[in-house]
């Protein structure tokens, strides 16, 4: 499956949509910024095999999809942009799932992968907790939007893993 190409294209589209979704000036939200501790160092220090990269990226996109599919999210963003963004994420999930099926039979280290997936889940838990604590304020959503854009850009090592032949 030609995942690096399609994922890169969809990722760019998702980023552009996310960029367009901004509703308020982020400069009015400087005091609300928060460190969510994206597990960048864990990812950077690891050479991902293709199946590992797929499953961790799938988890990241799934968690992002869940985050932006809530009622609170629907109230925060312009509906048509949110729908386009969700559709883009859904397509990415489908692409990744199709690739997993093609990659069956490839050896994997499940325990190591579980650690990365757990790190991603904890990261999104921190984001959800922050939104709850901030009562889903417009500034809280703006901070989260910037964080998700950054996490999409951060996962370069995962994308390198997609190009690898297992």
């Amino acid at each position: 499956c030609d995942l690096p190409q399609t994922h890169s294209l969809r990722n760019r589209r998702a980023l552009i949509l996310l960029a367009q979704m901004g509703r308020i000036s982020p400069f009015s939200c400087l005091k609300d910024r928060h460190e969510f501790r994206f597990p960048e160092e864990e990812f950077d220090g690891h050479q991902f095999q293709k199946t590992q990269a797929i499953s961790v990226l799938h988890e990241m996109i799934q968690q992002t999809f869940n985050l932006f599919s809530t009622e609170d999210s629907s109230a925060a963003w312009e509906q048509s942009l949110l729908e386009k963004f969700s559709t883009e994420l859904y397509q990415q999930l489908n692409d990744l799932e199709a690739c997993v099926i093609q990659e069956v039979g490839v050896e994997e280290t499940p325990l190591m992968n579980e650690d990365f997936i757990l790190a991603v889940r904890k990261y999104f838990q921190r984001i959800t907790l922050y939104l709850m604590e901030k009562k889903y304020s417009p500034c809280a959503w703006e901070v989260v939007r910037a964080e998700i854009m950054r996490s999409f850009s951060f996962s370069t090592n995962l994308k390198k893993g997609l190009r690898r032949k297992d």
Epitope: R12, L15, I16, A19, Q20, G22, S25, P26, F27, C29, L30, K31, R33, H34, E35, R37, V143, A146, E147, M149, R150
Partner: antibody
Framework: QVQLQESGTVLARPGASVKMSCKAS????????MHWVKQRPGQGLEWIGV????????TYNQKFKDKAKLTAVTSANTAYMELSSLTNEDSAVYFC?????????????WGQGTTVTVSS | DIVLTQSPASLAVSLGQRATISCRAS??????????MHWYQQKPGQTPKLLIY???NLESGVPARFSGSGSGTDFTLNIHPVEEEDAATYYC?????????FGSGTKLEIK
């Protein structure tokens, strides 16, 4: 690769206005904030303001809000800064710079600078 | 406005030694785990170059001899071991609140 190409040297009279340009290439122009920074000869750096080309949103340093006007034309991938009511204090090099890492608000790529000289 | 005071204004360091540049903010630029302080290098006739962001994160492609530390109001840029090509002016910049401001610069000379 990312490039920011600024317009050339400008010589202007006191009281006049000048408009300088910054043409971006190598990245998605509409999805990155663009900062403008001033540097007087032999001196430090001053942040003027920032524009989001995607929707034209601007935020200014209050010190420059009556001096500088930031605009962008997305079809040309170009950001502009207009300086009005020029005085000798406005003689400086002006840089356009791309915002980096979203809300960290640091600057990764810089244009080569436009030199403005105000003289009668 | 937050004032950033850099010291020293200039320093001369021998090749291979350590250069330490300080930047003090008139108000804290740290919130919730991040310190919004960044460092740039500007060589004569060139544009500034980002070295360090968020107080201690090394920008991609910047040599590991550059390091940043600090939080709240006190920040430091260290260069060790200093090389000839490090002769430049170094600026700190904060993005803690509006307006963003820069320090007045520290000129590093290599002996």
């Amino acid at each position: 690769q990312v490039q920011l190409q600024e317009s050339g040297t400008v010589l202007a009279r006191p009281g006049a206005s000048v408009k300088m340009s910054c043409k971006a290439s190598g990245y998605s122009f509409t999805t990155y904030w663009m900062h403008w920074v001033k540097q007087r000869p032999g001196q430090g750096l001053e942040w003027i303001g920032v524009i989001y080309p995607g929707n034209g949103d601007t935020t200014y340093n209050q010190k420059f809000k009556d001096k500088a006007k930031l605009t962008a034309v997305t079809s040309a991938n170009t950001a502009y800064m207009e300086l009005s009511s020029l005085t000798n204090e406005d003689s400086a090099v002006y840089f356009c710079t791309r915002n980096y890492k979203y809300d960290y608000y640091t600057m990764d790529y810089w244009g080569q600078g436009t030199t403005v000289t105000v003289s009668s | 406005d937050i004032v950033l005071t850099q010291s020293p204004a200039s320093l001369a360091v021998s090749l291979g030694q350590r250069a330490t540049i300080s930047c003090r903010a008139s108000k804290s630029v740290s919130t919730s785990g991040h310190s919004y302080m960044h460092w740039y290098q500007q060589k004569p006739g060139q544009t500034p170059k980002l070295l360090i962001y968020l107080a201690s994160n090394l920008e991609s492609g910047v040599p590991a001899r550059f390091s940043g530390s600090g939080s709240g109001t006190d920040f430091t840029l260290n260069i060790h071991p200093v090389e000839e090509e490090d002769a430049a002016t170094y600026y700190c910049q904060h993005s803690g609140e509006l307006p963003f401001t820069f320090g007045s610069g520290t000129k590093l000379e290599i002996k």
